[in-house]
């Protein structure tokens, strides 16, 4: 366990042309406020995910009224540190976002109001214990100067804070296998006790009474070999001879979220969705209202009418959650018609439409025949995007510009002979056949194999069938 | 627009039973805590149940006045609020409402309960 | 339990200022109690205006506006209308129990 530090040094202008106008006026004085959002690892997530290492809000700073005419100095800024508390290990790795919020304190109806002033973000590497880092963000016109540590609580220590210190037993010496505490000299470091019977090579702990197995090792004490046989249930069936996953404690197992937080299982660990009014890996953080400016990415937060709605924000397009926190897969709704292609730039949606679509949404089917003339008295039909013509006889291809054999396809069925004609084709049946394709074969006796004949006509007269 | 319609009021006698049954359309109901409200005639408001919403495992809470004999429930898959209301007094005839608070208060049309002998 | 103390009768003129007030028995109204404002009109017509203390309702005029006034919370009709005349209630929230005022009949002469 240990707490993050963050101190803000400055927030002003940036240096080079273009100084942004002081955020306030004689007429809207304001002040100014920061959160620190902390995540492990180094997360390519930007503020949509959440802040699985913790949160924190500084205090309001002094107001600020703009001198007229004035270029903006560097701001007033709060009191103190932000800090957030972590209760597992340092990850060593973690990406933050630090958001610098105005508070206008003019005459809004309903209180004062809020607004994102920039945002900044980044990934860094920190052991715990170490010094003060020194770092300075732009975010547009703006600059942020800022400096932030992590350091354990006692008695842990460490780069991860996962080692724990204990006082001295012995005047002179720590005990077998044990170091002094660095910093803490007149401390040694206590053996972590591992939950009873967690596997020495398989299995490590870091925190007393857990044991967290290695990569190929499963069970509630790491003895359990995971096998790539199959196994008959999601983590495995129990049986240790079979070399599968043993279902041990999950995750999620006893719900580690707190104030009604459900808890989901991630690749690496878990996850707690808070409900509104909870912040914190494991929602231990309570008591959020819009004074504590709850919402992300420029939500609008207003009061809740009870207290499971203790702050609602309004969140700006492409932001959802809660708390704004997580981005909008717009594309996921399929706004694009007729098979285009959805593309989500973050300020707005692009559909990239089909050949013969368009418009913001491909909703427009295009007059395929739209100049488009078809040869030799074809007409043109509209169809999924292009058109295609219909050709009178004797013509073909795409424009019915080509013309066609009707020959070609040889029509005339037991040995008829085809012969092309202004009108379409005309077949001299072989002996024994008739029909317009020779298709019907003529008996001996007369009588012949055609459907019944309509009134007035009889079945043997073949030159009514040409 | 958030609805909310009530439906199962009706004329009990006393120590009687009456389920009431609440429609909720055109909101994420899952989300959100339920209440119901009831107005005797000529009287003012009441606060009657209340039931959170799943994350807060579906806590309960009771006005004093009908606490042991009516029962918040609630169906997430159907959106449906209930009342389940047992031992009628006579001094439950009210007309019933399904309230849910987010950001203001949102109110159904009611159903009215008549206990009498 | 906690009582919530509304005045039970206001008389205001069209175009003046009336402000109603909500008073808790365990002590001065906070953000904490999420204090809700409801009109009342004939026919069982109930309307949400103002939640979490000043949040207007959609589609509620800008004349009605919700604040804490001292201990108090309080219900603001600044130039008030003919059609305001109804019965207002105000509610709070402790923890998760409810409690309504008796509510103020408003009349608009």
């Known amino acids: 366990a240990g707490v993050f530090e963050l101190q803000i040094h400055s927030f002003g202008p940036g240096p080079g042309p273009g100084a942004p106008r002081s955020p306030c006026s004689a007429r809207l004085p304001c002040r100014l406020f920061f959160r620190v959002c902390l995540k492990p690892g180094l997360s390519e997530e930007a503020a949509e995910s959440p802040c699985a290492l913790g949160a924190a809000l500084s205090a309001r700073g002094p107001v600020y009224t703009e001198q007229p005419g004035a270029p903006a100095p560097d701001l007033p800024l709060p009191d103190g540190l932000l800090q957030v508390p972590f209760r597992d290990a340092w990850p060593g790795t973690f990406s933050f976002i630090i958001e610098t919020w105005r508070e206008e304190l003019g005459d809004q109806i309903g209180g004062p109001a809020w607004s994102l002033l920039a945002r900044v973000a980044g990934r860094r590497r920190l052991a715990a214990g170490g010094p003060w880092a020194r770092d300075i963000q732009r975010a547009g016109a703006w600059e942020l100067r800022f400096s932030y540590r992590a350091r354990c609580e006692p008695p842990a220590v460490g780069t991860a804070c996962t080692r724990l210190c204990r006082p001295r037993s012995a005047p002179s010496r720590c005990g077998p296998g044990l170091r002094p505490c660095a910093p803490l000299e007149d401390e040694c470091e206590a053996p972590l006790v591992c939950r009873a019977g967690c596997s020495p090579e398989h299995g490590f702990c870091e925190q007393p009474g857990e044991c967290r197995c290695l990569e190929g090792w499963t069970g509630p004490l790491c003895t359990v070999p995971v096998s790539t046989s199959s196994c008959l249930s999601p983590r495995g069936p129990s049986s240790a001879t079979t070399g599968c996953l043993v279902p041990g404690p999950g995750p999620c197992d006893g719900n580690p979220c707190a104030n009604g937080g459900s808890c989901s299982e991630t690749p690496r660990s878990f996850e707690c969705t808070c409900p509104r009014g909870f912040y914190g890996l494991r929602c231990e953080v309570s008591g959020v209202t819009c004074a504590d400016g709850p919402c992300f990415n420029g939500g609008l937060c207003v009061g809740g009418a009870d207290p499971d709605s203790a702050y609602i924000c309004h969140c700006p397009p492409g932001f959802q959650g809660s708390n704004c926190e997580k981005r909008v897969d717009r594309c996921s709704l399929q706004p694009c018609r007729n098979g285009g292609l959805c593309l989500d730039l973050g300020h707005a949606l692009r559909c990239r439409c089909r050949a013969g679509f368009a418009g913001p949404r491909c909703e427009h089917d295009l007059d395929d025949c739209a100049g488009r003339a078809c040869a030799n008295g074809g007409t043109c039909v509209e169809g999924g995007g292009a058109h295609r013509c219909s050709c009178a006889l004797g013509f073909g291809g795409r424009d019915c510009r080509e013309r066609a054999d009707p020959c070609a396809a040889r029509p005339c069925a037991h040995g008829g002979r085809c012969y092309a004609h202004f009108s379409g084709l005309v077949c001299a049946c072989a002996p024994g056949y008739m029909g317009a394709r020779c298709e019907f074969p003529v008996h001996p006796d007369g009588a012949s194999a055609l459907p019944a004949a309509p009134p007035g006509l009889r079945p043997g007269d073949p030159q009514r069938y040409l | 627009e958030v609805q909310l319609v009530e439906t199962g009021g009706g004329l009990v006698q006393p120590k009687g039973s009456l389920k009431l049954s609440c429609a909720v359309s055109a909101f994420t109901f899952t989300t959100y805590a339920m209440n119901w409200v009831r107005q005797a005639p000529g009287k003012g408001l009441e606060w009657v149940a209340r039931i959170r919403n799943k994350s807060n495992n579906y806590a309960t809470y009771y006005a004093d006045s009908v606490k042991d004999r009516f029962t918040i429930s609630r169906d997430d898959s159907q959106s449906m609020l209930y009342l389940q209301m047992n031992n009628l007094k006579i001094e439950d005839t009210a007309m019933y409402y399904c309230?849910?608070?987010?950001?203001?208060?949102?109110w159904g049309q009611g159903t009215l309960v008549t206990v009498s002998a | 339990q906690a009582v919530v103390t509304q005045e039970s009768a206001l008389t205001t003129s069209p175009g003046e200022t009336v402000t109603l007030t909500c008073r808790s028995s365990?002590?001065?109204?906070?953000?904490?109690?999420?204090a809700n404002w409801i009109q009342e009109k004939p026919d069982h017509l109930f309307t949400g205006l103002i939640g979490?203390?000043?949040n207007r309702a959609p589609g509620v005029p800008a004349r009605f506006s919700g604040s804490l006034i001292g201990d108090k919370a309080a219900l603001t009709i600044t130039g008030a209308q003919t059609e305001d005349e109804a019965i207002y209630f105000c509610?709070?929230?402790?923890?998760?129990?409810?409690?309504f005022g008796g509510g103020t009949k408003l009349t608009v002469l």
């Open positions: 365990t002590g001065a109204v906070t953000t904490s109690n999420y």
């Open positions: 509610g709070l929230w402790y923890h998760n129990h409810l409690v």
């Open positions: 979490g203390t000043n």
């Open positions: 309230v849910f608070y987010y950001d203001y208060v949102y």
